[in-house]
């Protein structure tokens, strides 16, 4: 009897109630591989989820998140609230990045600005809540004897004025 089940293609199931004949999956269910003894109920994209791909008899529905949310987890198993650039999501909602950190996306956490001096460079452009600092030439390159096509900007410590 096992041979009968192995002949059942995706979109069907091996129906024990009907002498293991291949029966089509019931409405709103699917089997994505052959030889299945049951079909799986189609995923429903409701609430914060929206349908990216409709369910069929051979493949599950695929969900996205509605506007203002982004996917987390395998196959978009969760939707997490978007924040603005310069913010991160906390238990109490979206909060501005602390001084010295930035987030250039609507998701994820605030990360520390790059420490230019660790690479022997100076800060060319200050960091903000939304953008990392831009590192420029090393202080040695900015010495009076160094040749440069344009006058070098004065070296500044990483950071910006508190907001």
């Amino acid at each position: 009897l096992q041979d009968l089940c192995s002949n059942c293609p995706a979109g069907t199931f091996c129906d024990n109630n009907r002498s293991q004949i291949c029966s089509p999956c019931p409405p709103n269910s699917f089997s994505s591989a052959g030889g299945q003894r049951t079909c799986d109920i189609c995923r429903q994209c409701k609430g914060v989820f929206k349908t990216r791909k409709e369910c069929s008899s051979t493949s599950n529905a695929e969900c996205d998140c509605i506007s203002g949310y982004h996917c987390l987890g395998a196959e978009c198993s969760m939707c997490e609230q978007d924040c603005k650039q310069g913010q991160e999501l906390t238990k109490k909602g979206c909060k501005d990045c602390c001084f010295g950190t930035f987030n250039d996306q609507k998701r994820g956490i605030c990360r520390p600005w790059t420490n230019c001096s660790l690479d022997g460079k100076s800060v060319l452009v200050n960091g903000t809540k939304e953008r990392d600092v831009v590192c420029g030439p090393s202080p040695a390159d900015l010495s009076p004897g160094a040749s440069s096509a344009t006058p070098p900007a004065p070296a500044r410590e990483p950071g910006h004025s508190p907001q």
């Epitope: 029966s23 019931p26 269910s29 049951t38 051979t58």
Partner: nanobody
């Protein structure tokens, strides 16, 4: 009472083509899937192909590329176009229709009702 009646069977040479028809009759019948099955002499009834609830058409490996299922909704008819027939296609061909007794599609409902025709014999000689 739901009735399925197959027609179009007969004796043909290997390599020939044949088209089977299945007419469904019966008031208030609504199927979510229809399929073709066959039973060769001395063997179990086997799956040929089906039109699923979302109108996918699925075939068994043994007939894929040679057989084509189609429907004419206006005539409540399903067809099985069989090309390049082989002696091993010799069998009684049955059509089946599947229905669910109630429309709760949020739960997986295996309380399926199936209706079968009496079959039509296809003989392929070599």
């Amino acid at each position: 009472e739901v009735q399925l009646v197959e027609s179009g069977g007969g004796l043909v040479q290997a390599g020939a083509s044949l088209t089977l028809s299945c007419v469904i009759s019966g008031r208030t019948f609504s199927s979510y899937a229809m399929g073709w099955y066959r039973q060769a002499p001395g063997k179990e009834r086997a799956f040929v192909g089906t039109i699923t609830w979302n109108n996918d058409i699925i075939y068994s490996d043994s007939v894929k590329g040679r057989f084509t299922i189609s429907t004419d909704d206006g005539k409540n008819t399903m067809y099985l176009q069989m090309n390049n027939l082989k002696p091993e296609d010799t069998a009684v061909y049955y059509c089946a229709a599947y229905s669910v007794p109630y429309g709760d599609f949020c739960t997986l409902n295996y309380d399926l009702m199936d209706y079968w025709g009496k079959g039509t014999l296809v003989t392929v000689s070599s």
